[in-house]
Interface confidence: low
């Protein structure tokens, strides 16, 4: 687990003594884990001493499970405590604006691995002083393969004077088995150093190796401790009911024993596109052969392969007889790869095969149907629009059976697979491109290979439940567990009960569980406050996880609603979730940046890919001004945009020409510039006028306010000539045009280039520039305004619209009959565009995208009457009520 490594702050080399590295030694490293009814509470404490005569940099470095939420972090140095403060992301950002301006994750590195995520903080420790780190994190243990697993990554990098892992388990049902393994220890040493015991409701594991037991050899100063320390256990299931009620909250654990395995109908839908070549297809075939070998005679199955074409092995479900399994294995061994990825076709074929059960194979309708899809890339053939695929799959499955998606490797749009699975009662799992991919695939299959019940409904008295986690599950598998938690109304605890109904193999399953009040009182006496606290936090943890998952598959408004609920609960219960950050008061680096702790996303890069590290000093430093260099992103030669009195400039690369039009509207009107219905991304602009209106004359209007929104990540940016506000709807931080800053939020990077422009870059979206136009301060007529330019739009969907967005895709036009116009310097011509004939005029406009002060002249065909005939519909169709 944690490590502390020292680095000299001067060039002077020091001889390491005893367990010290460069004068720094780890006095103690302790992991305390307390489990109460599957809710695990971990506290990691590390004390590091700098015995050197100069400051040293140390790293506190550990890995925690991906599913865990950090709930506390504190550092104590020289008698001063620096305590983590959990806030919503935006407030943390606002409060420690300097950290955001730097564009760094402010010295705290969080990186995502397979099942663990890394947490690292670098600190400067004064000479002859000590520092203590304490990290608290929590998780709900999931039952898999008939056991719960506590995983603690151990990697101190040097010998530790007092090393200890202490796991204390309390399970009201009683503990039926308990084991602990340290993969990094020789067998005899493990037997000597790991103490484990369990009796009744209590279990205990203690690992406390001496310094000599940690050494990799008798004379070595290097440590053996490098790997996973695992504690596995299960609970007694003599009683079918496991219902805990404490402090107006309940937790219901459902994992009935002695049920007959249900026969299943399973269809495997496998990507055989070209990108699967090599190791991936080999591993997929190996896994399929093994899986087919483990099929039960009562099961029915089929295989669907999709590349450019879609092919099925049989086209309907066949029994898993020895002959059929042999033939299917031959088919698997023999298939070869195809070109593209017709994901939609493959899935719909697989769904059709399972849907035949309803239509033509009623004798199989009491089996558990399962669809498993494996892909390594994006859809490129047939229907490729993701929202259309989601719609097709949802409409074809119609809730009848779960869809499990396996995303092979890192080129897969895992988010898309997750949404699809969630919408269809399943889940997605990443298969890492590694030597053990075959085992990963088999491991996944083994979790769903033995369905015991389908359509499991866990019901609670409606008048008693105030909040509830997911209580309907499509299937229950052998070795797993269904957990439901909720809040109970006042005075309803004693009468609380649970009714469970499901379909099993050849029978209906139905039970009622009542609360055993005497047993509950006894438990509270034994475990007291911790039990109450853990049941409530278990409910909060599950609720937040569900809200975060649900966010992925709903519309913009509902997403905002779910986000605010999850945020509120994260704050109420002090969890660092994707919506919150923990800022550490009193800590700063040499630039005055303060660290903030965030939850990394599934796609966070591995540690070695993250940017430069920062080291923190434990003192309440005054931030010193710091500027990052300006974003020198190369701009395209000619861009599409809108500027000044709004002149819309549309570059048409296919024609190597440019079109222009103006929109004449009143100040205050908001126009839709870009709107991508596939992602919800939008840019709207509000017009402003001159300070003083000139009588009898058309007054210029300009963009005075822009709203850029990416609802998929709850991102909003409001830009005016005065300020730049991040997430204004959530009271977000305000930056000024005097700042030089890089702001990052969930796949959107905003670069503010001091008094000049800002660039917004959206992952898998577009890149846009906002130019600041300052007018002479003493002007009684004009006021400052904004220009907006599109630097890159090729990744935006074909359905993107808006006054600018509709031109992100090729537009055909022909110009003929060029003749002198009313102004001899500006010829007129006839343009045919969208089957309309228009009279257009050649003119000059200014493009300020590369030179915000002087601009570059662009020659273009000007379309009169507010772009009539060129733009879709009338310009008034683009008037919208709000900036977001």
């Amino acid at each position: 687990l944690g490590s502390a490594t020292g680095r000299s702050k001067s060039s002077e080399k020091r001889q390491a003594v005893d367990t010290a590295v460069d004068g720094v030694f780890i006095r103690s490293l302790k992991v305390n884990c307390k489990v109460t009814s599957r809710f695990a509470h971990y506290v990691v404490t590390s004390q590091v001493v700098n015995t050197a005569n100069e400051a040293r940099e140390v790293a506190f470095d550990l890995e925690i499970p991906k599913t865990a939420f950090i709930s506390d972090f504190a550092v104590t140095a020289d008698g001063n405590a620096f305590i983590g403060d959990i806030k919503d992301k935006v407030t943390a950002w606002k409060q420690y604006r300097k950290a955001a301006i730097s564009g760094e994750n402010a010295g705290l590195v969080r990186a995502s691995g397979r099942t663990m995520e890394q947490f690292t903080i670098h600190l400067t420790v004064n000479p002859q002083s000590k520092v203590t780190f304490q990290l608290t994190y929590e998780e709900v243990l999931k039952r898999n393969h008939m056991q719960y697993e506590i995983v603690i990554k151990v990697k101190p990098k040097q010998l530790v004077h007092h090393f200890e892992i202490d796991v204390d388990i309390f399970e009201p049902q009683g503990i039926s088995k308990l084991d602990a393994q340290a993969s990094f220890l020789p067998k005899e040493l493990a037997a000597q150093t790991i103490k484990k015991s369990f009796s009744g409701k209590k279990g205990h594991v203690l690992f406390r190796p001496t310094v000599s037991q940690q050494q990799s050899c008798p004379t070595c100063s290097t440590s053996l401790l490098n790997g996973h320390f695992k504690v596995t256990y299960d609970v007694s299931r003599d009683k079918i009911c496991d219902l805990l009620v404490a402090n107006n909250h309940f937790a219901h654990f459902f994992a009935p024993q002695n049920l007959t395995n249900m026969n299943k109908n399973v269809v495997f839908v496998i990507d055989i596109s070209g990108s699967m070549r090599g190791q991936k297809v080999k591993q997929t075939k190996e896994a399929l052969l093994k899986i087919l070998g483990d099929m039960q005679p009562g099961d029915y199955f089929d295989l669907v392969l999709f590349g450019t074409r879609v092919q099925s092995w049989k086209g309907s479900l066949v029994q898993a007889s020895e002959a059929n399994l042999q033939a299917a294995q031959d088919f698997v061994r023999g298939f070869s790869l195809d070109e593209a990825t017709n994901l939609n076709g493959g899935l719909l074929r697989g769904i059709e095969i399972l849907n035949q059960v309803q239509e033509s194979l009623p004798e199989l309708s009491n089996h558990a149907s399962i669809l498993i899809m494996l892909t390594d890339g994006d859809p490129t053939e047939g229907v490729t629009d993701r929202s259309q695929i989601l719609k097709n799959v949802r409409n074809a499955i119609r809730g009848r059976f779960p869809l499990y998606n396996l995303g092979f490797g890192h080129n897969v749009d895992f988010n898309f697979l997750e949404v699809m699975s969630m919408e269809n009662n399943g889940r997605a799992q990443r298969i890492y491109e590694d030597h053990d991919a075959t085992q990963q695939l088999q491991g996944f299959y083994s979790q769903v290979a033995k369905p015991l019940l389908v359509d499991v409904d866990l019901q609670y008295p409606q008048d008693a439940v105030l909040a509830l986690t997911q209580n309907h599950h499509k299937q229950y598998y052998e070795g797993s567990e269904i957990v439901v938690a909720g809040r109970i109304a006042d005075n309803k605890q004693s009468s609380f009960k649970a009714d469970v109904q499901a379909h099993g193999e050849g029978q209906e399953f139905s039970i009622t569980c009542l609360v055993d009040e005497e047993e509950m009182k006894k438990l509270l006496r034994e475990r007291g406050h911790m039990l109450e606290n853990h049941v409530e936090r278990l409910w909060a943890y599950l609720t937040i996880q569900e809200l975060l998952a649900k966010r992925m598959k709903v519309d913009r408004e509902e997403r905002a609603n779910l986000s605010s609920q999850a945020l509120q609960m994260s704050l109420d219960y002090g969890f660092v979730t994707p919506l919150t950050s923990m800022s550490i008061r009193g800590m700063a680096d040499q630039d005055g940046l303060k660290p903030t702790i965030d939850k990394p996303s599934e796609d966070s890069p591995p540690l070695e890919m993250l940017g430069p590290r920062r080291t923190f000093v434990l003192s309440a430093l005054q931030p010193s001004p710091t500027h990052s260099s300006s974003n020198t992103q190369r701009l395209p030669d000619r861009v599409t945009g809108v500027d000044t009195d709004p002149h819309f400039i549309i570059h048409v690369p296919q024609k190597e020409d440019t079109l222009c039009f103006n929109i004449n509207e009143e100040p205050g009107v908001i126009l839709s510039l870009v709107q991508d219905p596939n992602t919800g991304f939008s840019v709207n602009g509000q017009l402003i006028g001159n300070k003083a209106r000139s009588p009898g004359q058309h007054d210029g209007t300009y963009f005075g306010r822009l709203g850029i929104a990416n609802p998929a990540t709850d991102f909003q940016l409001e830009v005016t000539p005065q300020n730049i506000t991040l997430n204004p709807g959530f009271g977000g931080p305000v930056f000024s045009w005097r700042d030089q800053a890089v702001l990052r939020q969930d796949g959107v990077v905003v670069t503010i280039n001091k008094k000049r422009n800002l660039v917004v870059s959206v992952d898998d979206g577009g890149t846009f520039e906002v130019v600041l136009h300052r007018v002479w301060k003493g002007s009684s007529v004009h006021q400052d305004f904004l220009g907006f330019y599109v630097l890159d739009s090729h990744r935006m969907s074909a359905r993107t619209h808006g006054l600018l967005g509709q031109f992100f895709h090729p537009i055909g036009f022909e110009v003929s009959d060029i003749h002198p116009g009313s102004d001899p310097t500006k010829p007129d011509a006839t343009m045919v565009v969208r089957n309309r004939r228009l009279t257009v005029t050649r003119g000059l406009q200014k493009d300020y995208s590369k030179d915000p002060w002087h601009g570059a002249e662009v020659s273009c065909w000007f379309i009169h009457n507010n772009g009539a005939g060129l733009i879709d519909g009338a310009y008034t169709d683009y008037i919208v009520p709000d900036i977001f």
Epitope: T308, R309, V310, Q311, S312, N342, G345, L348, R349, E352, E381, G382, S387, K391, N392, R394, N395, A396, E423, V554, D555, R556, P677, N678, G680, R799
Partner: antibody, heavy 116, light 111 residues
């Protein structure tokens, strides 16, 4: 049971607008696209456009882009289509229909007659 | 846009005989084994009713005398044996890309 209940027949004057409704029941309204189809007297079926109530995403047939506007009210599980600048050419039966890739449920149709 | 051409425009078939309606698309609406073509029946004063989805899959509740076939650009709806109640107009429809389009319709009369 899935049902799509459309609003009653409309007799309107040329140049005016009309807004018709389609109330859905028996399924999760936000999970399916709602399409609108026109059928002029004695003629075939023409696709106008569709809307996804889950996100308000819309697609329009180019021919109807400046004629039809599709909206939804998820709180009442109702889809709406507004037709503007009506002419006698717009006299037809307008159907709403739920879809995945095909139309499995249809409303009974709203007859619009444009006459001065 | 994909144009669907139905033929014949009208058809008179004796009771108990086979009715065959053809639909040709201006471009392929199929992947190698999946076709985005669907068939509907419409009787006067009623909305259309789905008969066949994905070229050949019978919608539940539709009599087995209706069948569909074809892929790529050429598709066929067969009714055999035709019954009195099959008097209606039949439409094909694709869902390959936006805009979805319908064929012009085939009016079936029972002799």
């Amino acid at each position: 049971e899935v049902q799509l209940q459309q609003s009653g027949a409309e007799l309107v004057k040329p140049g005016t607008s009309v807004k018709m409704s389609c109330k859905a029941s028996g399924y999760t309204f936000t999970s399916y696209w709602m399409h609108w189809v026109r059928q002029r007297p004695g003629q075939g079926l023409e696709w106008i456009g569709d809307i996804y109530p889950g996100t308000d995403s819309t697609n329009y047939n180019e021919k109807f882009k400046s004629k039809a506007t599709l909206t939804v009210d998820t709180s009442s599980s109702t889809a709406y289509m507004q037709l503007s600048s009506l002419t006698s050419e717009d006299s037809a039966v307008y159907y709403c229909s739920r879809s995945g890739d095909y139309y499995d449920y249809w409303g009974q149709g709203t007859t619009v007659t444009v006459s001065s | 846009d994909i144009v669907l051409t139905q033929s014949p425009a009208s058809l008179a078939v004796s009771l108990g005989q086979r009715a065959t309606i053809s639909c040709r698309a201006s471009q392929s609406v199929s992947t190698s084994s999946y076709s985005y073509m669907h068939w509907y029946q419409q009787k006067p004063g009623q909305p259309p009713k789905l008969l066949i989805k994905y070229a050949s899959n019978l919608e539940s509740g539709v009599p087995a005398r209706f069948s569909g076939s074809g892929s790529g650009t050429d598709f066929t709806l067969n009714i055999h044996p035709v019954e009195e109640e099959d008097t209606a107009t039949y439409y094909c429809q694709h869902s390959w890309e936006i805009p979805w389009t319908f064929g012009g319709g085939t009016k079936l009369e029972i002799k």
